[in-house]
Interface confidence: low
């Protein structure tokens, strides 16, 4: 169980001409509020298929009335975070939609009119419990700028909100309502409680004690807007009550991806994701065939069906990306079982196990006889996170604490009789077969199927099975 | 996988009441307009009431304005249709609808809807 939160921070005309003055139509003044839509997985999903992850909308921002002659700004904001809570593991990887929608207020018969004036699509990885990440994106003559994470609530911990933790003061036993139990961590990896009066909604803290601000935003408390001139002109809201919104200055500004592209802040830097037909570190490269070898990592390189994509990479296994040159992180999946650590070697996966268990994704549970005693010298026997004995003769059942009765089966072969001894049982045989099981025939003129009958004993003789 | 289940249908004699319940799974209904519609044998499916996302507004049809209310229980991602003073003429199966856009169109198109139940018997005898 967790929460999956998005920050709008700003949403206005996206730079360069031709971009839109204002959001309202010529009919008077209106508001905006955000949609937010997530799906699993990193499939190009249609537009129409539902939120299977959950989805949220945002409370109306501020009513905007457009001034004539003065400079387009930024957009009065709906305050607050959109939350989405989901019940189940957090993916790892997922599409996030981000819809901006214009409720016109002007005199429309009926009240208010709603139109979608821009849709966001991002698919992206991300773990639970990791820090605010942060996207710039373009959608037409609009620019968004937002943050957003996924934390994980209740008891639950790790990268997927899928292990269970328990507080050292609370009783070993499950309590209601958590289910399944399994596995208990020993302790809660609970999120460190930040320094007294960190800000909620522009700090963070990854030890206790400590209060980081978001970019944009400085102080002990990270309440004190880094720069007021970054709240001026085309780069967010400034208001007395909510300070400024906007990060300062990131490598995305301006959006360095030509052509199309989408810009990302990685740590000190930016990454562009192209559209078919262009690659380069800013889709600054175009007019590409197969012939340039546009298809990196071993991609295959087929002619596109249409004009518009001129080629298409079929990556191999472990890259994606319109020219496979992004590596897939296959550990967000989760493979190594039991706690394990997971690492990606390119040619493989690996998993790291804990104390305790083994196997390529640490599946086997080496502790499965740990304490288990098997009575009456009986052999434990691993497997499957459960132990099993297998038994002396003579005994049976789960610890080999009951008798068994070695005739019960009929070991005695041809009509031999079985006599239960201290050491196992005993075959009588019928005359004329022989054996320990009274499996072997006498041949008529008295030499036994064997090579030769063990030295004592006549054919005839009872067989003693050692 | 998305699905919407219709319940509460049955035979109820003219005069009487139904309440149809419609739960979603594989989606939330929170942020999607939702709708009931119904088709008699014979007839196109037409729009009865409609429920929109953004301000949550309702719209009735006028054949059952004063009889029939539409209403949505996010938390349990289920939509409802309580349906009061029943005519013979109510006789139809009944359909629940969800679509992204936030609000209602004004001429009770089924088009724009992208999701469909199965749909719920209703009898109403005289």
């Known amino acids: 169980a967790g929460v999956f939160e998005l920050q709008i921070h700003s949403f206005g005309p996206g730079p360069g001409p031709g971009a839109p003055r204002s959001p309202c139509s010529a009919r008077g003044p209106c508001r905006l509020f955000f949609r937010v839509c997530l799906k699993p997985g990193l499939s190009e999903e249609a537009a129409e298929s539902p939120c299977a992850l959950g989805a949220a909308l945002s409370a109306r921002g501020p009513v905007y009335t457009e001034q004539p002659e003065a400079p387009a700004p930024d957009l009065p904001l709906p305050n607050g975070l959109l939350q989405v809570p989901f019940r189940d593991a957090w993916p790892g990887t997922f599409s996030l939609i981000i819809e901006t929608w214009r409720e016109e207020l002007g005199d429309q018969i009926g009240g208010p009119a709603w139109s979608l004036l821009a849709r966001v699509t991002r698919r992206r990885r991300l773990a639970a419990g990791g820090p605010w990440a942060r996207d710039i994106q373009r959608a037409g003559a609009w620019e968004l700028r937002f943050s957003y994470r996924a934390r994980c609530e209740l008891l639950a911990v790790g990268t997927a909100c899928t292990r269970l933790c328990r507080p050292r003061s609370a009783p070993s036993r499950c309590g209601p309502g958590l289910r399944p139990c399994a596995p208990l961590e020993d302790e809660c990896e609970a999120p460190p409680v930040c320094r007294a009066g960190c800000s909620l909604e522009h700090g963070f803290c990854e030890q206790p004690g400590e209060c980081r601000c978001l970019e944009g935003w400085t102080g002990p408390l990270c309440t004190v807007p880094a720069s007021t001139s970054s709240c001026l002109g085309l780069r967010g809201p400034s208001s007395a009550t909510t300070g400024c919104l906007v990060p300062g200055p990131g490598p995305c500004d301006g959006n360095p991806c030509a052509n199309g592209g989408s810009c990302s802040e990685t740590p000190g830097s930016f990454e562009c994701t192209c559209p078919r037909g262009f690659y380069g570190l800013r889709c600054e490269v175009s007019g590409v065939t197969c012939a340039d070898g546009p298809c990196f990592n071993g991609g295959l390189c087929v002619g596109g069906a249409d004009p518009d994509s001129a080629y298409i990479c079929h990556c191999p296994p472990g890259f994606q990306g319109s020219n496979c040159e992004k590596r897939v992180d296959r550990c967000s999946l989760q493979p190594c079982r039991n706690g394990g650590l997971c690492l990606d070697l390119g040619h493989a996966l690996r998993c790291r196990c804990r104390a305790g268990f083994a196997g390529p994704r640490c599946e086997h549970n080496l502790d499965d006889c740990a304490g288990r005693a098997c009575a009456n010298g009986g052999t434990c026997v691993e497997g499957g996170g459960a132990h099993r004995c297998s038994c002396a003769l003579g005994f049976g059942g789960r610890d080999c604490r009951e008798r068994a009765d070695p005739c019960a089966a009929r070991p005695c072969a041809h009509g031999g009789r079985c006599y239960a001894h201290f050491s196992g049982l005993v075959c009588a045989c019928a005359p004329g077969y022989m054996g320990s099981r009274c499996e072997f025939p006498v041949h008529p003129d008295g030499v036994s199927a064997l090579p030769a009958a063990p030295p004592g004993l006549r054919p005839g003789d009872p067989q003693r099975y050692l | 996988e998305v699905q919407l289940a219709e319940s509460g249908g049955g035979l109820v004699q003219a005069g009487g009441s139904l309440r149809l319940s419609c739960t979603a799974s594989?989606?939330?209904?929170?942020?999607?307009?939702m709708g009931w519609f119904r088709q008699a044998p014979g007839k196109e499916r037409e729009g009865i009431s409609c429920?929109?996302?953004?301000?949550?507004?309702?719209y009735t049809a006028d054949s059952v304005k004063g009889r029939f209310t539409i209403s949505r229980d996010n938390a349990k991602n289920t939509l409802y249709l309580q349906m009061n003073s029943l005519k013979p003429e109510d006789t139809a199966m009944y359909y629940c609808?969800?679509?992204?856009?936030?609000?209602?169109?004004?001429?009770?198109?089924?088009?724009?809807?992208?999701?469909w139940g199965q749909g719920t018997q209703v009898t109403v005898s005289s």
């Open positions: 609808a969800a679509k992204a856009h936030p609000d209602c169109s004004g001429d009770w198109s089924p088009s724009g809807y992208e999701y």
């Open positions: 594989g989606f939330t209904i929170a942020v999607y307009t």
């Open positions: 429920t929109s996302w953004a301000g949550g507004r309702t």
